[in-house]
């Protein structure tokens, strides 16, 4: 009689991350006696995935009854398949024996493949804010996916970025992967409305990407602009004194008015007027009644804004001659403010 | 070489449930079968539940099946195994083992590290 073969037609099998995975295994006697194991790797180090004789199995199966006389098949299905489940099965026949059953033979081994689908990419940004024309890092994090081929794209407001540095780790076989890439990005004055997006493909996908997105209003700070302008109002002795606080971002911003160095009145920017590209402009105005005073008067709008150091505009009031219009404002831009009279 | 180190032991009812962990270092977790067993005083040290490297298999001596629950976290190098319904004769030291080698119920044969031991004592 010919002499037992085990028999594993398939030389690979590839299985998506959750789903089962059938091992085929037949042997082409019932002789000798004894049982069948299947175990994952070969030599001393192997692991022993299934003994027909003893165990507990969770995940595994048999295909059919193994405790029939004359069952010659020996297949096995893993469920609930991860990553770490990849590697050579092999399954063996053991030859009955005292005290210990003997390795008799075994099959040529079939190779699982594991296919796992990234995580959904995580995008950061810098810590703390930077202003236009400044180059700040994003980094983007997928993890989780096998095989370890990949492909990263970054993009900002729909065009292709070329400067960032992706590595997939670790760089020899491993059950699952990891990607990192770091773009560089240069911010605009026009960015409080631009994303940041980072684009993963990979074969689980089936060509519908994974993206990851940053939004630049997180990132950016954009310094407002002072204008300081007066203009008469009422009787005669009263001027009013506007400052214009235009193109800031974000929102945080604190102003105050300063009469010959001496602080007059802080206030918050709270109804502010926003632009198309995100950002913000306030106007606050001081009432002054130049009939009090007998020289000239510096006023100084000082503003500082989202915790940066203040930045100013001063005004030269004359009080000897005829206060004239010396500037104008839109009616856009005039939110409004308090009212104060310097006596 | 491998160090285990043992907790989770102590003294508790009968019925109650304990569980007993050992964390595993020097070598790679993930390529180490584990096994714990036990030794009453008096008695020679006993089989008590192995699993292989991924988990995906595990063994049980038969006084224990059902009772005992034998787990791995091969992220933090950890082994447990969950005891519940202890009863008097549960009274021993528990031992944790690492084999590089796994053959089912051959684990004690094949167990090349063993831990120190932690003591569960199941008062009636």
């Known amino acids: 009689e010919e002499e037992l073969q085990v028999i594993q037609p398939d030389k690979s099998v590839l299985v998506a991350a959750g789903e089962t995975a059938t091992l085929r295994c037949t042997a082409t006697s019932l002789i000798p006696v004894g049982p069948i194991q299947w175990f994952r790797g070969a030599g001393p180090g192997r692991e022993l995935i299934y003994n027909q004789k003893e165990g507990h199995f969770p995940r595994v199966t048999t295909v059919s009854d193994l405790t029939k006389r004359n069952n010659m098949d020996f297949s096995i299905r893993i469920g609930n398949i991860t990553p770490a489940d990849a590697g050579t099965y092999y399954c063996v026949k053991f030859r009955k024996g005292s005290p210990d059953d003997v390795e008799f033979k075994s099959g040529a081994g079939t190779e699982l493949s594991v296919r796992a689908k990234p995580s959904a990419p995580v995008v950061s940004g810098p810590a703390a804010r930077a202003t236009p024309q400044h180059t700040v890092s994003f980094t983007c994090e997928s993890h989780g996916f096998s095989p370890r081929d990949i492909t990263l794209k970054w993009f900002k407001n729909g065009n292709e970025l070329s400067d960032f540095q992706t590595n997939v780790d670790p760089v020899g076989e491993s059950v699952s992967y990891s990607i990192h890439s770091t773009a560089k990005v240069v911010l605009t004055r026009e960015d409080v409305h631009s994303q940041v997006i980072c684009e993963v493909a990979h074969v689980t996908l089936q060509g519908d990407p994974l993206r990851g997105t940053a939004n630049l209003s997180e990132t950016i700070r954009v310094p407002p602009t002072l204008e300081v302008t007066q203009q008469p109002v009422r009787a005669e002795n009263q001027v009013n004194v506007t400052c214009q606080v235009r193109k800031f971002y974000p929102q945080r911003l604190q102003l105050t008015w300063l009469e010959n160095g001496n602080v007059s009145r802080t206030e918050t920017a709270s109804t502010v007027t926003e632009n198309k590209d995100g950002t913000y402009n306030w106007m606050s105005w001081l009432l002054v009644n130049v009939s009090a005073h007998r020289d000239d008067v510096k006023l100084t709008c000082q503003v500082e804004h989202d915790g940066q150091p203040a930045v100013s505009k001063s005004h030269d009031l004359k009080v000897s001659a005829h206060p004239k219009e010396q500037g104008s404002n839109t009616a856009a831009e005039n939110t409004g403010s308090n009212e104060r009279n310097i006596y | 070489q491998v160090q285990l180190q043992e907790s989770g032991g102590g003294v508790v009812q009968a019925g109650d449930p304990l569980r007993l962990s050992c964390v595993a270092s020097?070598?790679?977790?993930?390529?180490?079968?584990m096994g714990w067993f036990r030794q009453a005083p008096g008695k020679e040290r006993e089989f008590v539940a192995g699993?292989?490297?991924?988990?995906?298999?595990?063994y049980y001596a038969d006084s224990m099946k059902g009772r005992f629950t034998i787990s791995r976290d091969n992220a933090k190098n950890l082994v447990y195994l969950q005891m519940n319904s202890l009863k008097p004769e549960d009274t021993a030291v528990y031992y944790c083992?690492?084999?590089?080698?796994?053959?089912?119920?051959?684990?004690?044969?094949?167990?090349?590290?063993w831990g120190q031991g932690t003591q569960v004592t199941v008062s009636s």
């Open positions: 699993i292989s490297r991924s988990g995906i298999s595990q």
């Open positions: 083992a690492a084999a590089l080698t796994f053959r089912g119920s051959d684990l004690p044969r094949d167990s090349n590290y």
């Open positions: 020097g070598r790679t977790f993930s390529s180490l079968d």
